[in-house]
Structures are given as C-alpha cells and as structure tokens.
Interface confidence: medium
C-alpha cells in the first residue's frame, strides 16, 4: 500500500498511546545519555506533527519518510556534538546513510548506573503520574538496551504498571514489589538478549541466517503447521525483525500486529496452542504467540529418510531448488526434534547440505548420501556430553562455584578480553546451571545451547566494539551456528604474556561490607580474573586458597568496629599473602 504520509498512516494504525511509546523508545535507543525530559519534549513535537498530518496528509513535510523526520529531529538538538561527539557527524550525511550512521553509534554497553528499585519512591511516582511513570520505564529500559524489541517493551511496560497497581495498595509495598520486579527484570534481560541475537544474526550474517533460525524454531513449536504456512510466517517475521533492528519501530510494531492477526485468523492450520493467546488484547496477544507452548507432533509422521535419503530424486530436488529443498529438510527435521537446540538443528542442516553438494556431483549419488543421517550423531553427542559434564560440575560446586570455574576456564582461553566483560559473560554462562540443569532430560539440550547462544552473542557484541582477541573474533564471525562449539573448543592461550601485578587491583574498601551479595561476588570475581591475568598458570589449589583467604579477610574487616581502618591495615598483608601463594 502507498500512503501520502507515512507518519499519518502509522499514527492511525497504532493509535496515539502506542505511537508515543514507540517514538520515545526510538529516541531513547539513539540518544542514550539524554535526560528523560528532553525525550518527552521530542516525542511531544513529533506527536503534534503526526496529528497535523492525520488532519491533512498534504501538509508541509508530511510526505517525508519517518527516517528523515526522526533524523532531522535528532540533528536539530543543539548540544548533540557536545554530548555525543562523532554521532553529530552523521548529520552531515543524507538518508539512508544518515540512519545507518545513527545505528552504528548505538552503544551496547552505555555508562548508565544500574537501576535500584526503591518501593516507596516508586509508588509515590506511580500514584502521582501514571503516564509519566510508564514513559520513564520505557526510557530507562530502551536507553540501556538500544536493540530492545520495541513492541515487546510496550508489553513489559504494561506488566510493570500492573505490578505497581497491585503492590502500591499493599500494606508492605516492598515485600509485594521487590520479588515481582526482580522476576520481571529477569524476563526483560532475557528478552533483550534474545532480540540482540536476532539483530546480530540479521546484521552480521544476513536475512537468510535469521530465516533459517526462525524456520527451525517455528517448526519445533508448530509441528502441525505445514511447511508453506511456516514459510509465510518466517518471511513476515523476518520483515518485522529487520525493521525493529533497523530502527523502524513504527513500521515494525504495525507489521507485528498484522502478523499476530494473520496467525490468529489461521490458527486452525498452525497450532492448537494459540486459542487463549488470540483472545487477548494486541500486545498480550503478540507476546503470548511468541511464547506459545509447543504443539503436539502429528501422529502420522513418516520417516525422514524416505524423502531425504531413499528417494531417487534427491539430487534433482536439491539442484533445481536448493533453498526450498533444504528448507523442507530443516522443517521436517526440526518438527520431529523439539528436544534439539536451534543451533544444533542448523548444524545438522549444514551437514546435510554439504553432503548433497559433494554427493550430487559424483557418479552414484544415492550410494554416496545413503549414510548421511549417520553423520548427525556426533553433532548431537557433542553438546549432550558437554551439558552432562557441566551440569555435574554445577551440582557439585553450586552456582557461585560454577561461575568461578567458568571464569577460570574463559580467562585462560581469552585472557586479552577486558576484565568486566569476562566477569559479566562468565557469570551469565554460569547461570545456565540453575536455568537448565534441573530441567527434564529432553529439555536440557535446547535450554542450555539456546541460552549459551544468547550469552556468547553478548561477548561478541562487546568484543566487536573493542577487538582484542583474534580467537574471539574468529569464533564470533566465522559461523553463527558454530559459535558455541568454537568457544568450547578453545584451549588456554599459551601465547599470552602475563600482566604485571598491580597492587591497586587488589585494594578494597569499607563499601564492600554493605554491598548486596551479587555485587560482592562481582568484586571477588573481578579479583579472580585479574589474578589469572597475572598468573595464567595458577593451579586450582592456589586459586581456591586465594579465594578462601579473600573471603576470610573480607569477613574479618566487615566484622571489625572500623571497617576502613581494617581494610587499610589488612589489605596490604592480603596482597603479600596472594603473592606468596602464587609465587
């Protein structure tokens, strides 16, 4: 469809509330350091302008693209260069280069303090101005996560408001709010990581990589839907995510709503698990569809071998329509294997493709590809064994101990990576234990590998900004589906030159005593990484001793009447002790 005014079209489709929310998210994801009030002003101006275009689509500037309108707004900010430096250089470019330039300046690791919920203050804000409270939430999440899936953020903002509606009435606001906010925070962080991986796959590996990922995932979830139906959804979904990852949030949200509508209208041919989703309002409906439970497999599925090994026409099918044939293979394999991770399914499809590529050029192709399915077993065994070993380690060490084991493992593999990144990534990798190891056997593999893909993507995203390790670059860029096996296969870096011992790194202060448990752990784990960078060959025994001594030293000083004085006296002794243990 062509519209005289794109902004008027989106305003009418989305309605004022969602329109304003999405515009706020868009600006917050680009200008991550601007105060909330500045963004509100921009949103107000854009909304007023959109309304004039709704009233008269021929009004001045209404025919401009949304990129042009948004870009002009950003570039009109007087303090742009002062606050954002070379982001202002984008303003010298024309569209579409200007928008591409803005996208490249998004910061995945902005220097913004962690949000600490204060129930009393938050309830006061909520009761004073609900609309502002909603906007502030969108702003705070969007600026910290510049690739957050915008329509999904609108959904989380509704849930956030609901939590406050309920808990601000409660006698003990904190007891009601804190666990709910923490639960929501985990969901939001997972959602951010999932979307970041989707955007990375589109931007770094192309739309086809994203479509293959979606085809496998949707085939697992909707095994009753036929290939054609899944393909249509995959195509539409790719468009939605391409738009959101590209900053076209209004178009993205609009197209997502259309896709939800289509899925619900055709749910009879897609899945039996969508009924209750389709009765919900728009944002809840889209979220529910995205999280829908896996449908049961059809009872009459034929052996895969028939179409993909025994059929004499395999090479004809492969040669004449490669993508469709391989797509059908991936669909058929995925719907039969809800227990496999998406990455594993894509690795299997790659092996199948490589085998046909080789065999179909030979004299007797059927004899050559007859055993292709046997080649898949090692691909399945590798992650299964790895998960088994790591879950055993997790059971033995507990979450904190398991994280420390991963810190040691990854610091030895890639010691060039910055300490904060190693700590963040290893801590997140360590959470796979509590997330997945308790799951039933048939869910463990997909749970673990798909979660690890999210965490390793975070490492890749952070490393790309300041590349320091060729090994990391290689694992991140060579193959999306082989990232996890690539990192797993890395061995300790023997070429690494140990860091000088810097005493300041091991200097601690009284603030350590009042820190929440997780922040205390981060301090200790930061010291552990620094220790390993200084002594990469430290034994497990030495590291255990140092960590034990560290815990004793902190406990002693936090129990002393004058914390700071104790740290000042005992700190240097602890440093000498460390050096002695590692000598």
């Amino acid at each position: 469809d062509t519209y005289k005014s794109e902004i008027a079209h989106r305003f009418k489709d989305l309605g004022e509330q969602y329109f304003k929310g999405l515009v706020l998210i868009a600006f917050s994801q680009h200008l991550q350091q601007c105060p909330y009030e500045e963004h509100v002003k921009l949103v107000r101006e854009v909304t007023e302008f959109a309304k004039t275009c709704v009233a008269d689509e021929s009004a001045e500037n209404c025919d401009k693209s949304i990129h042009t309108l948004f870009g002009d707004k950003l570039c009109a900010i007087p303090s742009l260069r002062e606050h954002y430096g070379d982001l202002a250089d984008c303003c010298e470019k024309e569209e579409p280069e200007r928008n591409e330039c803005f996208l490249q300046h998004k910061n995945d690791n902005p220097d913004i303090p962690k949000l600490k919920p204060d129930p009393v203050a938050l309830c006061a804000d909520f009761q004073e101005d609900e609309q502002k409270f909603w906007g502030k939430y969108l702003y705070e999440i969007a600026r910290r996560h510049p690739y957050f899936y915008a329509p999904e953020l609108l959904y989380y903002a509704i849930i956030y408001k609901d939590v406050f509606s309920e808990c601000c009435q409660a006698a003990d606001k904190a007891a009601c709010l804190l666990p709910k906010i923490e639960h929501l925070r985990e969901k939001v962080l997972t959602s951010a990581a999932k979307q970041r991986l989707k955007c990375a796959s589109i931007q770094k590996f192309g739309e086809r990589a994203f479509k293959a990922w979606s085809l496998a995932r949707l085939s697992q979830r909707f095994p009753k839907a036929d290939f054609t139906e899944i393909s249509k959804i995959v195509t539409d979904l790719a468009k939605v995510h391409k738009e959101c990852c590209h900053g076209d949030l209004l178009e993205c949200a609009d197209d997502r709503a259309d896709l939800a509508k289509y899925i619900c209208e055709n749910q009879d041919t897609i899945s039996t698990k969508l009924k209750e989703c389709c009765d919900k309002p728009l944002l809840e409906k889209s979220h529910c569809i995205a999280e829908a439970k896996r449908d049961e497999l059809p009872a009459d599925l034929n052996p895969l071998e028939h179409d993909f090994v025994e059929d004499k026409e395999v090479c004809k099918n492969y040669k004449e329509a490669k993508h469709v044939f391989l797509g059908t293979f991936l669909y058929e394999y995925s719907r039969r294997h809800p227990d496999y991770s998406v990455s594993l399914l894509l690795r299997i499809a790659k092996i199948y493709e490589a085998t046909l590529e080789d065999c179909c050029a030979k004299e007797d192709p059927p004899a050559c590809y007859a055993t292709v399915f046997d080649k898949f077993q090692p691909l399945v065994d590798e992650p299964k064994n790895l998960i088994k070993q790591n879950c055993e380690l997790f059971e033995k060490l507990g979450e904190y101990g398991f994280q420390n084991a991963l810190i040691v493992r990854y610091t030895k593999k890639v010691p060039q990576v910055s300490t904060p990144t190693l700590v963040e990534v290893a801590r997140k990798l360590g959470l796979v234990g509590s997330r997945c190891c308790k799951r039933p056997e048939e869910e463990r593999l997909s749970c673990a590998e798909d979660y690890l893909s999210l965490v390793l993507n975070r490492l890749c995203v952070l490393h790309e900004k300041t590349p320091v390790s060729e090994k990391v670059t290689k694992c991140c860029t060579e193959s999306l589906v082989n990232r996890r096996p690539c990192f797993s296969a890395l061995t300790p870096d023997e070429t690494y030159k140990p860091k000088e011992f810097v005493e300041g790194t091991f200097t601690f202060h009284a603030d350590l005593c009042t820190l929440p448990e997780d922040e205390k752990q981060i301090k200790k784990q930061t010291a552990l990484v620094e220790l390993l960078k200084h002594k990469p060959h430290a034994t497990e025994e030495q590291l255990r001793t140092v960590l034990g001594n560290f815990a004793a030293f902190v406990q002693k000083c936090c129990a002393a009447p004058d914390h700071e004085a104790c740290f000042a006296v005992e700190g240097p002794k602890f440093v000498i002790e460390i050096r002695g243990i590692l000598a």
Epitope: A225, D300, D307, D311, N317, E320, A321, V324, F325, T328
Partner: nanobody, 126 residues
Framework: EVQLLESGGGLVQPGGSLRLSCAAS????????VAWFRQAPGKEREFVAG????????YYADSVKGRFTISRDNSKNTLYLQMNSLRPEDTAVYYC???????????????????WGQGTLVTVSS
C-alpha cells in the same frame, strides 16, 4: 482440509488423447507437491506423474515419459494431466493426490500422500 476433485476421464481409442483435471480447495496448492496415480483392476496403485510446489519440477514414471505431461494453473487452483498416444495398458482409475507443505518432494509412494480425489476412469479400447 484439502478437497480434490478429478474430471476429464472417459473412453478413448488407442493412440488418442485425453486431458484430466483436478480442482483443489487448498489455498497453497501452488506451493504443494501434487501427483497423479492410477490403479488398474486387480493391480497396485502406481505413480504416474508429479509436480513440485513453488518451482515446477516435474517427475514421470518411465512408462509414460514423452507421452504424458503434468501441469497446473495456479490462478484456477487446478492440476492437469495431458495424456497423448494412449495405449490399452493405460486403462485405469486416475487419482490426483496432494502433499501440502511439501514443495518439491513429490514422492512416488502413494502412502505418503494424505489427500486424494475420488478418481476418474480412463478406458483405452478400440
């Protein structure tokens, strides 16, 4: 649910021609593997010709290659089988079959097709 309805059968002399049609109710028939099978009295059902979905890749049984042509008209949601140089051994009930969601994979195995028409009789006799 996919409904298939064949037409065009009848009595024809050896060497003559017939064109069978199969109208489908499925909205994605253009992207679906569809085929013609036949069953002569007292014999097994056998594959005659097939056409892949999306990309029109065609497949034929050796016994009909060069004489029969399978095609479809996506705008009419209809599959055709043009039969020339007919022989008495082509006498059979001809069925149209569909495998939705299986573009390309036109199997020659009847059991793999979930949807069938009711059949149309072709008799080749002088």
């Amino acid at each position: 649910e996919v409904q298939l309805l064949e037409s065009g059968g009848g009595l024809v002399q050896p060497g003559g021609s017939l064109r069978l049609s199969c109208a489908a109710s499925y909205r994605y028939i253009d992207e679906t593997a569809v085929a013609w099978f036949r069953q002569a009295p007292g014999k097994e059902r056998e594959f005659v010709a097939g056409i892949g979905g999306g990309v029109d890749i065609t497949y034929y049984a050796d016994s009909v290659k060069g004489r029969f042509t399978i095609s479809r008209d996506n705008s009419k949601n209809t599959l055709y089988l043009q039969m020339n140089s007919l022989r008495p051994e082509d006498t059979a009930v001809y069925y149209c079959a569909a495998r939705p969601g299986r573009p390309l994979i036109t199997s020659k195995v009847a059991d793999l097709y979930p949807y069938w028409g009711q059949g149309t009789l072709v008799t080749v006799s002088s």
